[in-house]
């Protein structure tokens, strides 16, 4: 009689990435008779929640139902019936969260309480929302990135299963950018980890890891533009700000009491006789870049060297992986190629910034304006914290690779933090099985 | 030293307005959340309204909301209340007091209050 | 609103003996219950943060325990200036405080 294949014995896990500025549900999926293989847990699903960030509920707790609703229901269909119960479900807050909490403990554990009653609502497992740190962001993404180029496999490949796979296990480095936060993490060359708080050490498949991560609080894009901005207008003589990181011609209005309505701008706060003032866009890369230049503070290092704000850096060692809105902003200036050097990246920034708003409008129709308007800006600093924060040069930027997804899963620290809540990443290397015989019957 | 002085309490007609302040010194004043807190002659102490560090929350007591607006100028570390419609249950000794912080993290408690400043709403 | 309910209202206490107050919120707070003595014509004054961490310069006699909807402050031993009025607050929802107790020393 002919082999027929059996029900796939498949599981489902779920996590909730509530960023800062928006929040998105990933769905993965990997067969159960291989959890601890390395490698088969794969992205089946993203859906991206309508609407802001958890953190800017705080004065509307009771919306957050009907907000995470959308997102959960298509879980529901993505997932199959018989197996809702089974499916763990996992929120992980990040910056933004601990940014209100810094505002206000009471006012995040309200947040997350509510968080956590609307997801307990649905068939699945859930298993609790929670504020990660940025220490867990960093190495999350870390292992995310790692495990899905197969850095952690102990069979040496003939072939590359991406583009920038090397085939040597040396783990990649994890660049991350957020909206409030960004992390850097990877395993220094014979270093020793100056400052506790930066030090991790891993154990998996086997093997030991020791990892530098520090997540800077404040430094993600939108919280950086903020601080940009409460920085500037100290010193504008008057409600009009011309901003060399908006393109020309672009004018928009800001309220005071918005510049100041996180602790990001708090070292910038005064009084200005102005309720409200204008950006007035003026478009020039090199003055965008001086003026991101005065959010780092690289005059004092207690180390053999720093990043910037006193926070021990070692030297950086191998590649590196840059994801989240590393590519998507590199990808919107389609300069993600391995091909585009720094110096090219750069030539090109400049003359992104330098053109017209009302040709940048026409140019890219379909972009919402609020975005668009932010590019100049968000490239700007990418180009200013690898360079000068991270101290990436032109030479070792051939090792950046912009990441937006490996093999169908999107690169970030959700992964990893399922993995490691599932338990899927065994510390010792698993005995290896003969090929499993319950495929056929 | 932590120092809390609140003033422009008074005599007023019900219908009326007034404003009150409080000028703050000794801590950095932009990195806590204040408050305001009332006392009516012999009873117990009643919340009023929250200003949060950074202005993310803002709130009032159900008794004063539409008619009281809390404001701050970090910097002339003053907290303001603006009461409007006053009314004669409004009559109370009224506390400026400052948010605790757990650890890091900022707290919904009390940890400093000033001596207070007395609103009559009388005809 | 949460509603916190305080027991006794009043109490009389011998110096070096115990006194316990108790608080009951009409819905879970977490451990977000904080305790204050007032004294005549003073303002309040922060005893116990977040259920049981002791404010500074408060006297390790005061102590506070208890978690959810059930919370108690303990002054252990008492002594007379003790004499006040104490209150609990809850911070989980828009602040609200109990009613009051007051202590006399005997």
């Known amino acids: 009689t002919q082999n027929k294949a059996l029900p796939e014995n498949v599981k489902y896990g779920i996590v909730l990435d509530a960023g800062s500025s928006h929040t998105s549900l990933y769905i993965y999926k990997w067969p159960a008779e291989k959890e601890n293989d390395t490698g088969v847990v794969h992205q089946v699903e993203e859906c991206r929640v309508k609407g802001p960030g958890i953190s800017k509920f705080v004065q509307k707790v009771n919306e957050i139902g009907i907000y995470l609703t959308d997102c959960m229901e298509r879980a529901r269909e993505v997932i199959p019936r018989s197996q809702h119960q089974e499916t763990p479900v996992y929120l992980g807050a990040t910056a933004g969260m601990r940014l209100l909490r810094m505002e206000s403990e009471e006012l995040a554990d309200r947040v997350l309480d509510v968080v956590e009653r609307s997801l307990s609502n649905y068939p699945f497992d859930f298993q609790g929302a929670r504020i990660i740190t940025g220490q867990e962001e960093g190495a999350y993404g870390w292992i995310t990135i790692n495990y899905l180029l197969g850095k952690f496999s102990q069979k040496t490949r003939w072939f590359s299963i991406v583009p920038y796979e090397t085939n040597n296990q040396e783990t990649f480095g994890a660049l991350d950018l957020g909206g409030a936060s960004t992390q850097v993490t990877f395993v220094p060359q014979n270093q020793t980890i100056e400052s506790p708080d930066n030090a991790l050490q891993f154990r998996l498949y086997g093997k030991d890891y020791n990892v530098y991560t520090h997540s800077f609080l404040c430094y993600g894009k939108d919280q950086a533009l903020w601080q940009k901005l409460a920085k500037d207008i100290q010193v504008a003589s008057n409600e009009i700000l011309r901003d060399p990181c908006f393109h020309p011609g672009y004018k928009k209005v800001v309220n005071v009491s918005d510049l100041y309505k996180t602790p990001c701008t708090k070292r910038f706060e005064m009084t200005l006789p102005f309720q409200q003032f204008e950006i007035q866009g003026i478009g020039n890369y090199q003055q965008c870049h001086q003026s991101i230049l005065e959010l780092f503070n690289t005059s004092y290092c207690p180390y053999s060297q720093c990043a910037f704000n006193g926070i021990f850096l070692p030297p950086l060692q191998g590649d590196f992986g840059a994801f989240s809105a590393f590519y998507f902003v590199m990808k919107f200036l389609n300069l993600t190629s391995e091909k585009v050097s720094q110096e090219k990246v750069t030539e090109m920034m400049k003359k992104f910034c330098a053109q017209p708003w009302e040709e940048i409008k026409t140019s890219y129709a379909g972009v919402k304006e609020k975005y668009l308007s932010e590019y100049c800006f968000s490239g700007t600093y990418i180009l200013s914290l690898l360079l000068q924060g991270y101290h990436f040069t032109a030479d070792s930027w051939e090792h950046i690779h912009f990441i937006g997804k490996i093999q169908g899963s999107d690169a970030g620290w959700t992964l990893g933090y399922m993995l490691n809540l599932t338990n899927m990443i065994p510390a010792e290397q698993p005995l290896s099985t003969p090929l499993s015989h319950s495929t056929y019957v | 030293e932590v120092q809390l002085v609140e003033s422009g309490g008074g005599l007023v007609q019900p219908g009326r307005s007034l404003r009150l302040s409080c000028a703050a010194s000794?801590?950095?004043?932009?990195?806590?959340?204040m408050n305001w807190v009332r006392q009516a002659p012999g009873k117990g102490l009643e919340w009023v309204s929250s200003f949060s560090s950074s202005s993310t929350y803002i709130s009032y007591a159900d008794t004063v909301k539409g008619r009281f607006t809390i404001s701050r100028d970090n910097a002339k570390n003053s907290l303001y209340l603006q009461m409007n419609s006053l009314r004669a249950e409004d009559t109370a000794l009224y506390y400026c007091?400052?948010?605790?912080?757990?650890?890091?993290?900022?707290?919904?408690?009390?940890?400093?209050w000033g001596q207070g400043t007395m609103v009559t709403v009388s005809s | 609103d949460i509603v916190l309910t305080q027991s006794p209202a009043s109490l009389a206490v011998s110096p070096g003996q115990r006194a316990t107050i108790t608080c009951r919120a009409s819905?879970?707070?977490?451990?977000?219950m904080h305790w204050y003595q007032q004294k005549p014509g003073q303002p309040p004054k922060l005893l116990i943060y977040k259920a049981s961490n002791l404010a500074s310069g408060v006297p390790a006699r005061f102590s506070g325990s208890g978690s959810g909807t059930d919370f108690t402050l303990t002054i252990n031993p008492v002594e007379a200036d003790d004499t006040a009025n104490y209150y609990c607050q809850q911070s989980w929802n828009d602040p609200t405080f109990g009613q009051g107790t007051k202590l006399e020393i005997k």
């Open positions: 000794g801590f950095t004043f932009n990195n806590y959340g």
């Open positions: 007091a400052r948010h605790g912080r757990y650890g890091g993290y900022g707290g919904f408690y009390f940890d400093y």
């Open positions: 819905e879970g707070v977490k451990s977000y």
